[in-house]
């Protein structure tokens, strides 16, 4: 009759688990793209925005060929945890302007948390170490100004978009190697 309702599906096929992770990543990518577009429309960005506390992009066209599943999943999880911290920070510290995007930011945070749980599950199924590599957590201080928090929001959503875009490509490529 199958597992009771609400219990996680036990899968012996890591590719099915990877498929599920790809699906969630794609869904989050679409949400991020939509929210980034909303941000640009509501608060037009002048040029590119960066934030020192954001993780550097882990993948590029040059590194796709040498990807290994343990490294990709571990790095992706660490980077997404950083983005989760940044989204939480935006919601709490971003100022009244960003409160107008509160339903969307809240939904984005929930999806991000869901994807992180899925990656954790996938790593445990593949018997990969759960411990994130040691890296200093930069405390996220108050925005210097409202304009600064809007610029930070553009940087966070832009960086998350790029990270998820490469994550989908990387995970799909790794699936073919399983």
């Amino acid at each position: 009759p199958g597992p009771p309702a609400g219990s996680p599906r036990v899968s012996s096929d890591p590719r099915a688990d990877l498929d599920s992770a790809v699906l969630l990543t794609r869904s989050l990518l679409a949400d991020t793209r939509q929210l980034a577009a909303q941000m640009r429309d509501k608060f037009p960005a002048d040029g590119d925005h960066s934030l020192d506390s954001l993780p550097t992009l882990a993948m590029s066209a040059g590194t796709l060929g040498s990807l290994q599943l343990p490294g990709v999943l571990t790095r992706l999880r660490v980077d997404l945890m950083s983005y989760l911290r940044h989204v939480q920070w935006l919601r709490r510290a971003g100022g009244p302007s960003l409160k107008t995007l509160e339903p969307e930011l809240g939904a984005l945070q929930a999806r991000l948390e869901r994807l992180l749980r899925r990656l954790q599950l996938l790593m445990s199924r593949l018997a990969l170490p759960q411990a994130a590599p040691d890296q200093p957590v930069i405390p996220l201080g108050p925005p210097a100004s409202a304009w600064g928090s809007i610029r930070a929001a553009h940087a966070i959503l832009g960086g998350l978009h790029l990270t998820l875009d490469w994550a989908v490509r990387g995970l799909l490529l790794l699936k073919t190697r399983l």
Partner: antibody, heavy 117, light 111 residues
């Protein structure tokens, strides 16, 4: 140094209007959200309204919604509060305040508005 | 009636430590940062603590803020006569879409 100077207060009859101004200097005005906060004589602080750094987002306290309008002119480094249909309970010292996020890091000295017949 | 609840008064003698509480709900203190302001008699309020527990430059480290769940508190150690003032907590409220304040606590330094 950062300076916020309110003006436009005075005595006004119930039902009439008044416009408060807040002249800002010593910082890049167009980078900051700005608020109005008021304090009735002998009472506590009450938030009135906020306007985003470029003027597109505005929020108001329920007690002033539909009667007060917050606006700004970034070219003049000035914040405004247009107060219509004034009531006796609007009598207070009105402060403008600068905010980087949700905390008021600089306040003006305040301007007194008295609504009385 | 204020959305955030503070005791109307508090007192202490010089050198003592006093704590002022601020109670709210999940839509304000529970999900947003808490700030504290000091208002000396006849003057505009001044930022004392922001981001739950950060002090602006120039504020002595005798003042500290903390938060747990839907409550926050301001602690003042080594009380001085010049600390006699009104203290207000505040936070953004997601349900009201605005800033909410506590009713204020009048701190008296005895003796």
């Amino acid at each position: 140094q950062v300076q916020l100077v309110e003006s436009g207060g005075g005595v006004v009859q119930p039902g009439r209007s008044l416009r408060l101004s807040c002249a800002a200097s010593g910082f890049t005005f167009s980078h900051y959200d700005m608020h109005w906060v008021r304090q009735a004589p002998g009472k506590g602080l009450e938030w009135v309204a906020v306007i985003s750094y470029e003027g597109s987002v505005k929020f108001y306290a329920d007690s002033v919604k539909g009667r007060f309008t917050i606006s700004r002119d970034n070219s003049k480094n000035t914040l405004y509060l247009q107060m219509n249909s004034l009531r006796a309970e609007d009598t207070a010292v009105y402060y403008c305040a600068r905010t980087p996020g949700f905390h008021f890091d600089y306040w003006g000295q305040g301007t007194l508005v008295t609504v009385s017949s | 009636q204020s959305v955030l609840t503070q005791p109307p008064s508090a007192s202490g003698t010089p050198g003592q430590r006093v704590t002022i509480s601020c109670s709210g709900s999940s839509s304000n203190i529970g999900s947003n940062y808490v700030n504290w302001y000091q208002q000396l008699p006849g003057t505009a309020p001044k930022l004392l603590i922001y981001y739950d527990d950060l002090r602006p430059s120039g504020v002595p480290d005798r003042f500290s803020g903390s938060k747990s769940g839907t409550s926050a508190s301001l602690a003042i150690s080594g009380l001085r006569s010049e600390d006699e003032a009104d203290y207000y907590c505040s936070a953004w409220d997601d349900s009201l879409s605005g800033v909410v304040f506590g009713g204020g606590t009048k701190l008296t330094v005895l003796g």
